[in-house]
């Protein structure tokens, strides 16, 4: 429980944390662990998630060894006419779980953003809104003529895939790669995924990359000139270092970010590329992660409905990725 003994970490690599849970160095500076969340028990070795403003509250007496993860006192947030306390979580709609953190609101999608490739048993997968259900679900359309199943596998929907490229058909393997999904966060560091079978065993595998559509500190509307309605790609700002779970990128990057549209359109990445970024952690460990870099952004009216202010930024695909 405490840090008096020598460092002893499990032999296996760092644990895989659930979505939204930070991988952090334990309180002894020894091992990488999944950070404890609001209301969970914490110890010196099992720290709370610092990226959510949580600290281990031991209460009294002060020498207690086990505490509870508690939110730090900070500025409340104004959201949809309601005031939320810092650390307070709420659902803005059935699709988003939001948290107030020191005056600003961040939201995570509750609906899965998985992708589904055509397959022999489901040649025409479609996402549909089912009555009484909040999240869209995958359904399989039966082809009218069973003889078209083969060609149907090659007839990808533009919004989901690049291919097929005739050169990508290998022996007994039709190589398929979906587009990268939208970034999981509207601002700050998020994750984007895609599915591919472009590997030796022709097995479907999920690939992920880090992404940042815009920094959370950016007040992008300030840059919109009078009379204009949007700023797609703000002028490249000064070089920045990226941060990930307490680790900092070893290089600085002059990254492009997406702006905003004030006329109801959505502003999202349009052309992107994927590059490796090396992060150095406080314990000296270096980790290499693939990250999305934006080439161009686009403002468009193709926004899902529901009038949810986050809908315009989620579930949009990123076209023209170079990797």
């Amino acid at each position: 429980q405490n840090c008096s003994g020598p460092c002893r970490c499990p032999d296996e690599p760092a644990p895989r944390c659930p979505a939204g849970v930070s991988l952090v160095l334990d309180g002894c500076g020894c091992c990488r662990v999944c950070a404890k969340q609001l209301g969970e028990l914490c110890t010196e070795r099992d720290p709370c998630d610092p990226h959510k403003g949580l600290f281990c509250h031991f209460g009294s007496p002060a020498n207690r060894k086990i505490g509870v993860c508690t939110a730090k006192d900070g500025a409340p947030c104004i959201f949809g006419g309601t005031v939320y306390r810092s650390g307070e979580s709420f659902q803005s709609s059935c699709k988003y779980q939001c948290t107030c953190l020191d005056g600003a609101v961040g939201c995570m999608p509750l609906c899965s953003m998985d992708v589904r490739l055509p397959s022999p048993d489901c040649p025409f997968p479609r996402r549909v809104k089912l009555p009484g259900k909040c999240c869209e679900e995958w359904v399989c359309d039966e082809p009218k003529d069973q003889t078209v199943v083969g060609p149907a596998l090659a007839a990808y929907r533009l919004e989901d895939t690049f291919g097929p490229d005739p050169t990508m058909i290998r022996a007994n393997c039709l190589v398929q790669t979906t587009e990268w999904s939208a970034c999981s966060k509207t601002c700050g560091m998020g994750i984007s995924t895609r599915v591919t079978n472009d590997n030796a065993s022709c097995r479907l595998e999920k690939q992920s990359r880090l992404c940042m559509v815009r920094p959370c500190e950016a007040d992008l509307e300030e840059n919109i000139k009078k009379g204009k309605k949007c700023i797609r790609t703000p002028k490249i700002s000064k070089p920045i270092k990226f941060e990930l779970s307490g680790c900092t990128s070893m290089k600085t990057y002059r990254a492009k970010f997406c702006g905003v549209c004030t006329d109801g359109r959505c502003c999202t990445p349009h052309r992107t590329t994927t590059l490796p970024v090396e992060f150095k952690c406080p314990d000296g460990e270096v980790m290499k992660k693939n990250m999305m870099f934006i080439k161009t952004c686009a403002c468009h009216y193709n926004c899902p409905g529901d009038n949810d202010i986050f809908e315009s930024l989620y579930y949009r695909k990123m076209y023209g990725d170079m990797a």
Epitope: K72, G80, G103, A104, D219
Partner: antibody, heavy 116, light 105 residues
Amino acid sequence: EVQLVQSGSELKKSGASVKVSCKASGYTFNNYAIHWVRQAPGQGLEWMGWINTNTGNPTYAQGFTGRFVFSLDTSVRTAYLQISSLKAEDTAVYYCARVRYGMDVWGQGTMVTVSS
Amino acid sequence: YVLTQPPSVSVSPGQTASITCSGDNLRSKYASWYQQKPGQSPVLVIYQDTKRPSGVPERFSGSNSGNTATLTISGTQAMDEADYYCQAWDSNTVVFGGGTELTVL
């Protein structure tokens, strides 16, 4: 550019009223609270309270109830501080500030001088 | 809730200046720091204990543990001479420290 621009200095007689304005530009006005802070000559910062720019609901700090009123005119993206029955001890610079991860944007301050 | 700062701190150019802010169980609150030069409005230099707004030099850093938050200015420059205020939230109330006058000798 994100800015809060306040009205100019005021010289008032004891017992009079004053209304200080704070005009916001460069960001979505009703997404962030506006706070008011007082600084008497040679003294530190003193928090007066804040106004919810979405609902217009004010919150006053201890010692700033009664004579102090926060209000809004969202059509011109402006917050107001009105002080009635002015006293000599109200002589101070009054600041408005936006809160987002701390008070990240401040007005230039309005000097209110109360003479007897 | 009370935040206590030393009234004054002196430092030689190029040296490290540390300004403390103490309050009961301050680690349970986010601490912010503001710099105020004579005749000017305060400027946010540290928020959420350790974070620096863009445009604030890297020599400014913050920490918060136990009952004390600390603003550290490494390689202090003459232009850093100013009053510094710590600030925290207590429930839904803002509390400022009394301020510290930093003199660069």
